[in-house]
Amino acid sequence: VLPAKPENISCIFYYEENFTCTWSPEKEASYTWYKVKRTYSYGYKSDICSTDNSTRGNHASCSFLPPTITNPDNYTIQVEAQNADGIMKSDITYWNLDAIMKIEPPEIFSVKSVLGIKRMLQIKWIRPVLAPHSSTLKYTLRFRTINSAYWMEVNFTKEDIDRDETYNLTELQAFTEYVMTLRCAPAESMFWSGWSQEKVGTTEEEAPYGLDLWRVLKPAMVDGRRPVQLMWKKATGAPVLEKALGYNIWYFPENNTNLTETVNTTNQTHELYLGGKTYWVYVVSYNSLGESPVATLRIPALNEKTFQCIEAMQACLTQDQLVVEWQSSAPEVDTWMVEWFPDVDSEPSSFSWESVSQARNWTIQKDELKPLWCYNISVYPVLRDRVGQPYSTQAYVQEGIPSAGPVTQADSIGVKTVTITWKEIPKSKRNGFIKNYTIFYQAEDGKEFSKTVNSNILQYRLESLTRRTSYSLQVMASTNAGGTNGTKINFKTLSISHHHHHHHHHH
């Protein structure tokens, strides 16, 4: 059987290294060797590249090496496949070296901001060593912020003047780290170089971008003053690297700017003690280059009625996120403030908050919250400068079995009855929503019985017990993940009813 006709011939000129052609089929059933016939010097010369020795047989690739690679030039290439049964020739293919030239990547040697020019990086690179001296090169510059996976690209061409080349990349974010990589190709070529080694540059710092401002209103003190915990952070969209030197706060009662008070702090939180009137609070951040735009907050008067518009709220878990959604009766409200913090018995150590716009849902990655911790989540509607009534819910990103079972005691022990009471498990040990309690009880050498009750029940009267019998009992608290037993207690039912004993006991 004759070999298959070589097809899909593809050639590439690796500048100053070799001219390589490949074709299909890559492998023949029987031993096949190939000849690649070339004409070059615009058809005046010809030669052959052969794969007829044992190491290169059955290999659908052949390379022509210097010094017979001339550039610029047009080549013709024809591949002959030969086996024991005969020869099969490919069609003749035509190749312009300028169109198939592949060169090395360039080397970025500098990525720097230019003093006084904002949001720009100047990229300087070295033209590849192995590239035609006089050729115009086309370039693709890829860049991304350091924490992003998504590359952006710009394309441009450069004449060869010197191998010190420059491109100014504009409209970047201030004070942000960028990763750069560059590739090039002769202007007429279809083949790009590989990408250069990635380099990192940082745009110039600017005055701070802005602040998000929020507050926690605490109950009024005995003297009538109201503690208000102010908190602020870099606005969403601010450069990752941005750092403020400090913050200026000023505040005054509505309609009375004469009573303005000012505070300077380097913290991102500050407690104010305000009167019962409406107050306005302003905060700016500053660095060595200037101040941010002003963040404004209205603190309502003590007796002000706040509007209510959130009708319902649901928290649900996806594979890696917690999603909170809410329904509102006020279509004009399109900004919301979400607060979340661990529901612990003591003062919460971490308190987080975030603004949501043009949406009625909020999402957080599960790994930003601690598993087995209950979180209080509150959503406040914000309409211009007014903050409405919050709607709150609780959520766990992952439930576990409680760390401890309920502490239980037996009260009012009777002849055939006993009242069991137990304490709620401390918040820190619940590890999930307690959905029910199960009482397990068993007479000495007898069968075990159980009774399950709702999580809001902390007392239960067991009946139909056997008189003068020792019982062991424990209460299990269960979450969605499973249950944990409390300590086992023992009691003995009475032989006869002791009313007088009970009277005495209550005195």
């Epitope: 090395e104 040697f109 070295i126 590849p128 060593v129 010197d162 191998r163 780290e177 080694q197």
Partner: antibody
Framework: EVQLVESGGGLVQPGRSLKLSCVAS????????MTWIRQAPGKGLEWVAS????????YYPDSVKGRFTISRDNAKSTLYLQMNSLRSEDTATYYC??????????????WGQGTLVTVSS | DIVMTQSPTSMSISVGDRVTMNCKAS??????VDWYQQKTGQSPKVLIY???SRSTGVPDRFTGSGSGTDFTFTISNMQAEDLAVYYC?????????FGGGTKLELK
Amino acid sequence: EVQLVESGGGLVQPGRSLKLSCVASGFTFNNYWMTWIRQAPGKGLEWVASITNTGGTTYYPDSVKGRFTISRDNAKSTLYLQMNSLRSEDTATYYCTRGPTTVVGGWFAYWGQGTLVTVSS
Amino acid sequence: DIVMTQSPTSMSISVGDRVTMNCKASQNVGSNVDWYQQKTGQSPKVLIYRASSRSTGVPDRFTGSGSGTDFTFTISNMQAEDLAVYYCMQSNSYPPTFGGGTKLELK
């Protein structure tokens, strides 16, 4: 084999001048940027000057800017460093290096043996 | 300019030891750090480029790692011929800057 051979070092008084040379062989000289790096006795390495392959652009640190001039003669495959207004802190071994380069292997894969410049009265 | 802080400045070691030295850049330099070896009376020689690529002919007991601002150079099985001063250099952006060097001495 790539070879870089420096010459021209010696003892010179403060304020005087000296010119270093570096003859390159074993590669196409006019394809590559070249750089001078120095090392004060018992101290670390410090970049001194770089020049592009055509000689069209030069780079210097502030410590030598205006006093030192890097140049090249591609026909002779030779790199130069003209050092004027020399100071005692310029005392060092001066190395000629090829690069920074687009060729894999680090920016400065090839170094000469160095030439010692001593600035002292 | 980017400052490269190398530690420790010197180490007393024995043949066969595992030797680790560090280099910290004053800003993010990606993976653009080279490590050089300079033996007494000789010019520097590049061992590792681009943080972790070994130069041709360099024994595999020499390794480099790191990215961003923190880089490590390790000799897994110290040999007598490895006694030298080792320098890191950032090649992220001109000017190239070197660490102060780590000198290896025998105990």
